[in-house]
């Protein structure tokens, strides 16, 4: 008789989803050389420890200590990029501007990107049947809990300037419920961080209005200038023609406003 | 086409160390994109995953055998290495060498095998 | 014991279809190998990824994966064919990959 299983909102672990943590590890170790020193049978072992056998409402950023431990990491403080809801671009950029970085461009972000994983309580099983929503079921699962911890702990390491990129298609260009809204914006250290500046992604071709008057943007800058933080903001009307512009900056068409 | 040789002592004595040597040929382990993995069956019986090492270092082992496994990787020489400690009798076994990939299990090529016995 | 579980023989005639399953715990949500090993001879690897034949491999090897059984199919089987068969996967328990105990196929 098949044993009874937790029915979950959400989809769940990625198929897959143990060798795929293996083998970004060690991807990710051979591209960043400061790394190699990384034993990714380890990372693996603290990475199932956080959520196998655990109920998968009832995560805590300290079920994710051994692994924030093994990955470890140091990023250039003034070079982070932090974004939200526009990933692809973020990235994009990143693969470009190669001395800036997301947080998908660290070791554990990198590990985790588009992956969905839980366990079940009691169990030494991976459940790939489904896993909790974070609306529809609970917030403590294994993979909110992942990137509240690690975007905390990305956004505490940030210094002097930090930028962040924001969706301008998007009803709400700041969003308070975002990871960045709700997580890395109160976990910047004002005596660390001079400046955030917010860069406004245009969405339409001929869409020239100032998106930095938006109003959830003035939201974003009064909860900035609360924590002593300095707050700036552009628009980037051209998504293409930025992009092309930090890949070719000497380019004559890249003096004009993007 | 790749080809992989494998080479060490037919004979170890028990609590001893075993350690065979693996040379690959016709392909760089250092161009990356491959797992390069040690195999075992006994005498009669199934295969065995021992573990791989990846050409920068990162290694994977069985977690039955962990405790006694170590492999290396010389990409100066083209080779990599096992070492298991603290042998029995159970180690006996064909020990093979493969090449890997990155998901794990597709070992496309192989060597051709080398018993170890364990006896003293 | 191993953790994916192959039936030890598999009996079939020239020209029919052989089936050979492998079992284990969530099977279908991890990729499956298959390889071929004759007496004396190393392990050849027939099918990877669930479904693909490496070049060289004929067309008569097929395979599927889903739920808890992978399934290795060899239609018109010949008496080259006779060699005994291995699954391999990544096995989550053990955390790490766990070849099958082997199938012994006979052509009879």
């Known amino acids: 008789v098949p044993r009874w299983r937790q029915q979950w909102s959400g989809p769940g672990t990625t198929k897959r989803f143990p060798e795929t943590v293996l083998a970004r590890c060690v991807k990710y170790t051979e591209i960043h050389p400061e790394m190699r020193h990384v034993d990714c049978q380890s990372v693996w072992d603290a990475f199932k420890g956080a959520f196998i056998s655990k109920h998968p409402c009832n995560i805590t950023e300290e079920d994710y200590q051994p692994l924030m431990k093994l990955g470890t990491q140091t990023v250039p403080c003034n070079k982070i990029l932090l974004w939200s809801r526009i990933k692809d671009l973020a990235h994009q950029f990143t693969q470009v501007q190669r001395d800036m970085f997301t947080l998908e461009d660290t070791l554990l972000g990198y590990l985790a990107d588009d992956l969905t994983w839980c366990g079940e309580f009691n169990t030494s099983k991976i459940n790939y049947q489904s896993c909790p929503d974070w609306r529809k079921d609970c917030s403590n699962n294994p993979v909110s809990v992942f990137w509240k911890t690690v975007s905390r702990r990305f956004a505490e390491a940030a210094c002097d300037v930090v930028h962040v990129m924001l969706n301008g298609s998007r009803s709400k260009i700041f969003d308070k419920n975002s990871t960045f809204g709700s997580v890395e914006v109160h976990n910047l250290q004002p005596e660390k961080v001079q400046t955030l500046e917010a860069w406004v992604i245009h969405g339409g071709r001929e869409d020239s209005r100032d998106l930095c008057q938006d109003p959830t943007i003035k939201e974003l800058e009064s909860i900035i200038s609360k924590r002593n933080i300095q707050f700036s903001c552009k628009n980037i009307y051209r998504p293409d023609k930025f992009l092309q512009c930090v890949k070719n900056p000497e380019d004559s068409s890249c003096t004009s406003e993007i | 086409k790749v080809q992989l040789q494998e080479s060490g002592p037919g004979l170890v004595k028990p609590s001893q160390t075993l350690s065979l040597t693996c040379a690959v040929s016709g392909g760089s382990i250092s161009s990356g994109g491959y797992y390069w993995s040690w195999i075992r069956q006994h005498p009669g019986k199934g295969l065995e995953w021992i573990g791989y090492i990846y050409y920068s270092g990162s290694t994977y082992y069985n977690p039955s055998l962990k405790s006694r496994v170590t492999i290396s990787v010389d990409t100066s020489k083209n080779q990599f290495s096992l070492k298991l400690s603290s042998v029995t009798a159970a180690d006996t076994a064909v020990y093979y060498c493969?090449?890997?990939?990155?998901?794990?299990?597709?070992?496309?090529?192989w060597g051709q095998g080398t018993l170890v016995t364990v006896s003293s | 014991q191993s953790v994916l579980t192959q039936p030890p023989s598999v009996s079939v005639s020239p020209g029919q279809t052989a089936s050979i399953t492998c079992s284990g715990d969530n099977l279908g949500d991890h990729y499956v190998c298959w390889y071929q090993q004759r007496p004396g001879q190393s392990p050849v690897l027939i099918m990877y990824?669930?479904?693909k034949r490496p070049s060289g491999i004929p067309d008569r090897f097929s395979g599927s994966n889903s739920g808890n059984t992978a399934t290795l199919t060899i239609s018109g089987t010949q008496t080259m064919d006779e060699a005994d068969y291995y699954c391999v996967a990544w096995d989550d328990s053990l955390s790490g990959w766990v070849f099958g105990g082997g199938t012994q196929l006979t052509v009879l």
């Open positions: 990824e669930d479904t």
């Open positions: 493969a090449r890997g990939g990155v998901m794990g299990g597709d070992f496309d090529y």
